[in-house]
């Protein structure tokens, strides 16, 4: 089948890194600079992705593979293949359209990205607050008074905070 196909379509013999040049009797020509073909039999080469501005180059483009970008420090990747860069914030903040804003009282964010989440409500589990929450850290729940009797187990980990729904802006 391959032999038959190559007789019918000379372009099928062109390997990755080349294209089938219709202007030159369908001979295989190398991809021009800043372009690539990742599969054989291509009639054109694709333009290399440019990593500039908010993006920086993680892997250079070659004749057979596209460039790969990540984000310039101060920003982080979003989307498949780092299709977007989003601004970092400090711990204790979240990103809004107005830039980085401090978490409201009663919420925290322990990362440079993502949203502020409510502190764990220890009382929902019948526990008390052992360590108060901050903008950067969740509360630490401690044992309830009933658990403090002799032989009671030590501090249990906090219940996971529920992700709040985003409010539209």
């Amino acid at each position: 089948f391959e032999r038959t196909r190559s007789l019918q379509d000379p372009c099928s013999n062109c390997p990755a890194g080349t294209f089938c040049d219709n202007n030159r009797n369908q001979i295989c020509s190398p991809c021009p600079p800043n372009s690539f073909s990742s599969a054989g039999g291509q009639r054109t080469c694709d333009i290399c992705r440019q990593c500039k501005g908010v993006f920086r180059t993680r892997k250079e483009c070659s004749s057979t593979s596209n460039a790969e970008c990540d984000c310039t420090p101060g920003f982080h990747c979003l989307g498949a293949g780092c299709s977007m860069c989003e601004q970092d914030c400090k711990q204790g903040q979240e990103l809004t359209k107005k830039g980085c804003k401090d978490c409201c009282f009663g919420t925290f964010n322990d990362q440079k990205r993502g949203i502020c989440r409510p502190w764990t409500n220890c009382s929902l589990d019948g526990k008390s607050v052992l360590v108060n929450g901050t903008k950067e850290r969740d509360v630490v729940c401690g044992p309830s008074p009933a658990d403090l009797s002799p032989g009671a187990s030590s501090v249990t980990p906090p219940a996971p905070a529920r992700e709040p729904g985003h409010s539209p802006q």
Partner: nanobody, 123 residues
Framework: QVQLVESGGGLVQPGGSLRLSCAAT?????NYWMNWVRQAPGKGLEW???????????YYVDSVKGRFTISRDNAKNSLFLQMNSLRAEDTAVYYC????????????????SGQGTTVTVSS
Amino acid sequence: QVQLVESGGGLVQPGGSLRLSCAATGFTLSNYWMNWVRQAPGKGLEWVANINQDGSEKYYVDSVKGRFTISRDNAKNSLFLQMNSLRAEDTAVYYCARGGTGYGSDHYGMDVSGQGTTVTVSS
């Protein structure tokens, strides 16, 4: 091809002014939020300002509030940054960057940016 090209940078004395421009090609500017970001020598990238599709919402990093003004001319597919009362700490490469089609709750990512224009504030 989607492209952003910045211009207008240069050497200016402290207290001086510059107006940066960003020309967009390959897409309709009026569909997108737009941003200016900057990178000072040896520092990370910093968001400076953004503007919504029709120019009715504009936001700035605290350090430039009252000194910088972001604006846009959708008819000319252009974005601008008027920089007044410039300080040495404003020295950086300035980039315009395309944001989302609607800043909702999902992300504030930027997917296209230019090569940048250099602003040097020095006496």
